[in-house]
Interface confidence: low
């Protein structure tokens, strides 16, 4: 296993009673220094399983705005530009962490929350169930 | 913008100096009550733009394990099961929030960090640049 030696300069921790509360610095460090976040912004239109992006806003959550992908078609777009229903457009989902204000409307107190978001769509071969 | 009325029962906030530090309850609430997180686990294989999942582990981060998608092919899989290079497999990326232990090795002190992860791949029509 990996041993994490404790840093002697850590803030004092409270006892192990739950729910456990920690200090989080909200001055976000962005590791994506060499990336252009818009570089994949046209994939939703050019994909064979295109999707629309829906804005989900919640002022009690951080980030307050999350974009949800909804596949445009049940099938996928073929070479002729038509929907081929022998294939399926499906959402690619990911669990992400958000911060939820708790108690509500408090600027300095949050709870960690996991939510499932659809990031985009991909085209898959359907699972066909043959009935005897 | 939306004004959030302050709850009188909020914990006392410190002064507004930055970096801003807040209290976060780490007993994660999971909103995905009706979802099976593994339900899309076979899309990576069934997609026309299949991908492999690479494990990225960092004990100084939460979540400590993140899975990164890497597209298997430059092209997409056609109806015959061959790679069609007239189409492109591309990663769908998303910025996510993680918690980074700061100072390092501290169990009760974190900094919010944004990282870009590839969640899966989708098949797109390539942008063709015609040279005069």
């Amino acid at each position: 296993g990996i041993t994490i030696p404790r840093n002697p300069g850590c803030p004092n921790s409270e006892d192990k009673n739950f729910p456990r509360t920690v200090m989080v610095n909200l001055n976000i460090h962005n590791r994506n220094t060499n990336t252009n976040p818009k570089r994949s912004s046209d994939y939703y239109n050019r994909s064979t399983s295109p999707w629309n992006l829906h804005r989900n806003e919640d002022p009690e959550r951080y980030p307050s705005v999350i974009w949800e992908a909804k596949c445009r078609h049940l099938g996928c777009i073929n070479a002729d530009g038509n929907v081929d229903y022998h294939m399926n457009s499906v959402p690619i989902q990911q669990e992400i962490l958000v911060l939820r204000r708790e108690p509500p409307h408090c600027p300095n107190s949050f709870r960690l929350e996991k939510i499932l978001v659809s990031v985009g769509c991909t085209c898959v071969t359907p699972i066909v169930h043959h009935v005897a | 913008g939306i004004t959030i009325p302050r709850n009188p029962g909020c914990p006392n906030s410190e002064d507004k100096n930055f970096p801003r530090t807040v209290m976060v309850n780490l007993n994660i609430h999971n909103r995905n009550t009706n979802t099976n997180p593994k339900r899309s686990s076979d899309y990576y294989n069934r997609s026309t733009s299949p991908w492999n999942l690479h494990r990225n582990e960092d004990p100084e981060r939460y979540p400590s394990v993140i899975w990164e998608a890497k597209c298997r092919h430059l092209g997409c899989i056609n109806a015959d099961g061959n790679v069609d290079y007239h189409m492109n497999s591309v990663p769908i990326q998303q910025e996510i929030l993680v918690l980074r232990r700061e100072p390092p090795h501290c169990p009760n002190s974190f900094r919010l960090e944004k990282i870009l992860v590839s969640v899966g791949c989708t098949c797109v029509t390539p942008i063709v640049h015609h040279v005069a």
Partner: nanobody
């Protein structure tokens, strides 16, 4: 946790842990152990779909399971060795990739019990 105790090498013990009141729908539950002065070691883990994984040191000897109501976690320990002597803790975290190692890595983000002592003499 309960079920700990003293046993001779080669013997068996069954640990149990009542896990109630958590809000996770997808979760990672499991057992880790610690010897004073040493690092925590993940032993076994089970996720909400029932998939199990084990540390190499206990594979084939220990079995993790939960009851039908998913409120009690068990660790059946067979063929015990002196090196299995430790304080054993059960833990639950909010899902994600579920192995004994990640259960320990992410302990700060879950709940764990007070522990039960297991002593194996040769």
């Amino acid at each position: 946790e309960s079920g700990g105790g003293s046993v001779q090498a080669g013997g068996s013990l069954r640990l149990s842990c009542a896990a109630s009141g958590y809000t996770y729908s997808s979760y990672c539950m499991g057992w880790f152990r610690q010897v004073p002065g040493k690092e925590r070691e993940g032993v076994a883990a089970i996720d909400s779909d029932g998939s199990t994984s084990y540390a190499d040191s206990v594979k084939g000897r220990f079995t993790i399971s939960e009851d039908n109501a998913k409120t009690t976690l068990f660790l059946q320990m067979n063929s015990l060795k002196p090196e299995d002597t430790a304080m054993y803790y059960c833990a639950i975290g909010g899902g994600g990739y579920c192995t004994p190692a990640t259960l320990v890595s992410d302990l700060d983000f879950g709940n764990w019990g007070r522990g039960t002592q297991v002593t194996v003499s040769s």
